[in-house]
Amino acid sequence: PKQTLPKPIIRAESTYMVPKEKQATLCCQGSYGAVEYQLHFEGSLFAVERPKPPERINGVKFHIPDMNSRKAGRYSCIYRVGELWSERSDLLDLVVTEMYDTPTLSVHPGPEVTSGEKVTFYCRLDTATSMFLLLKEGRSRDVQRSYGKVQAEFPMGPVTTAHRGSYRCFGSYNNYAWSFPSEPVKLLVTGDIENTSLAPTDPTFPDSWDTCLLTRETGLQKDLALWDHTAQNLLR
C-alpha cells in the first residue's frame, strides 16, 4: 500500500463564520519539514503555500480575501514532506454571513425562565429563506437547524443552568450563505434543584477550537534539547 503521512488539522482562525467582503484565514497544521501545503475547495486545488524555512514551522495560514458566497463551502488541506503526501484533512465548512437581511429572535416563555421549564426560540426572517440556524455564544459549532417559510422554532427540553447564555439566529440561503445575525437573546435560567454554583457557564471568549496553533521550532528549543542531552551524559 502507498505510504502517506498523517492527516493535517484544518482550522478557521477566530471563526468559520465570515462576514461578506471580509478576509477569512484558514490554518493547516501539518508537521515540521513540510515543504508544501495545498488548500482544496470543494475537492479542487484552491491555493498553495510553501513555508520558509520548512523545518522550522508546523503549518501555514491561507488568507482568503473578500469573502463571498462563491468562496463559501467545504475546505480541506494536505501537505508534502519531500515526495511524500499526507492524507487529506477533515473537511471544514466555511460560511459567509451578513448576506441580505437580519432575522429577529424571540424566546418563549421569555428570556428569564426557571429550571425545568420548556423553552422555544423563534427565529423570523421575512425574506425568502427556508433554513434557520440557532447558535449559542461560545458554542458556535453546536448549530441547531430548523425549517420554515418565514420563521422557525427551536424547542428545547426542560432547561437547566447549562442553557444559560446568549443566543443568536441566522436565516440561511444555502448551507454556506447565512444572513446577518439576529440581535442576541440572553437566556437566564434560575432555580436549579442541584447546586447552581457547579453549573457550567459560557466562555465569553471565542470558541477555543477556532484558534490557529502553529508553532515555530526556535533555536532556543534546539539549545534546550542539546543541554538536556549533555546533562544526561554528565549524570551517567
Epitope: 429572535l105 421569555g110 421549564e117 420548556k118 423563534y122 427565529c123 423570523r124 420563521q151 422554532e153 426542560p158
Partner: antibody
Framework: QVQLQQPGAELVKPGASVKLSCKAS????????MHWVKQRPGQGLEWIGM????????NYNEKFKSKATLTVDKSSSTAYMQLSSLTSEDSAVYYC????????WGQGTTLTVSS | DIQMTQSPSSLSASLGERVSLTCRAS??????LNWLQQEPDGTIKRLIY???SLDSGVPKRFSGSRSGSDYSLTISSLESEDFVDYYC?????????FGSGTKLEIK
C-alpha cells in the same frame, strides 16, 4: 399597574369578519408575547395563538389557523385578532393575555354572531 | 397535542378545609404549568406559574407541586372567595392546552 383593555362586546353578522382589540399598558409591550384564548358559554378555555410584538413571530393552534389572524400595532401597544367567515360557533368570550406564561389577562370581549 | 386531564370536575368543601386539585399531562411538560382562577364574572387571574411559583399578591394558602406527570394545586385553608373555577394550563408545547376546569363549591 399592568392592564389589558378589551371592548366588552361585539355583535356581528354570520359570514362577516371582526377585528378584536387588546390595548396594553403598564409594561413594555414589545418585549412580551400576547396570547388569545376562546371560551364558549359554559365551556372551558381554548388557546388560539400568540404573537411577539417585537419580532412579529406567531404561533397558532392548528385548529384556528384559517379562522384567526394575529397582528400588533406597536405604536399604540395594541394587539389585534381578526376572525373571518364568522358562524354561530364563533360566538364566545375572547380573552387576550400578556406575557409568555399568560401572566396577565384582559376582561374578555363577548362576541355574538347573529343575523 | 398534549392532553391535560383535570380532576375533580367539581368539588364541594367547607370553609377552612384543605383541598387539592390535580392535572395530569399526557406528555412531558417539564415545569411549564400554570394554575388559573376564574371568577363568575369571567375575570381570569393566574395564581401559580412554572408549577410552583406563586404570583405576587396571591395569598400564601395557595401552593403548587408536581409528582411525575401529576401537577397539583393545594389550598391549605379555604376562604369564601376561593369558591370559583380553577384551570391548569400547559405552556410547554404548542398548542398550549388547558385542563377542563374544576368548580369549587361551598358545602
Amino acid at each position: 399597574q399592568v392592564q389589558l383593555q378589551q371592548p366588552g362586546a361585539e355583535l356581528v353578522k354570520p359570514g362577516a369578519s371582526v377585528k378584536l382589540s387588546c390595548k396594553a399598558s403598564g409594561f413594555t409591550f414589545t418585549n412580551y408575547w400576547m396570547h388569545w384564548v376562546k371560551q364558549r358559554p359554559g365551556q372551558g378555555l381554548e388557546w388560539i395563538g400568540m404573537i411577539h410584538p417585537n419580532s412579529g413571530s406567531t404561533n397558532y393552534n392548528e385548529k384556528f389557523k384559517s379562522k384567526a389572524t394575529l397582528t400588533v400595532d406597536k405604536s399604540s401597544s395594541t394587539a389585534y385578532m381578526q376572525l373571518s367567515s364568522l358562524t354561530s360557533e364563533d360566538s364566545a368570550v375572547y380573552y387576550c393575555a400578556g406575557g409568555g406564561r399568560l401572566d396577565y389577562w384582559g376582561q374578555g370581549t363577548t362576541l355574538t354572531v347573529s343575523s | 397535542d398534549i392532553q391535560m386531564t383535570q380532576s375533580p370536575s367539581s368539588l364541594s368543601a367547607s370553609l377552612g378545609e384543605r383541598v387539592s386539585l390535580t392535572c395530569r399531562a399526557s406528555q412531558d411538560i417539564g415545569s411549564s404549568l400554570n394554575w388559573l382562577q376564574q371568577e363568575p364574572d369571567g375575570t381570569i387571574k393566574r395564581l401559580i406559574y412554572a408549577t410552583s411559583s406563586l404570583d405576587s399578591g396571591v395569598p400564601k394558602r395557595f401552593s403548587g407541586s408536581r409528582s411525575g406527570s401529576d401537577y397539583s394545586l393545594t389550598i391549605s385553608s379555604l376562604e369564601s372567595e376561593d369558591f370559583v373555577d380553577y384551570y391548569c394550563l400547559q405552556y410547554a408545547s404548542s398548542p398550549f392546552t388547558f385542563g377542563s376546569g374544576t368548580k369549587l363549591e361551598i358545602k
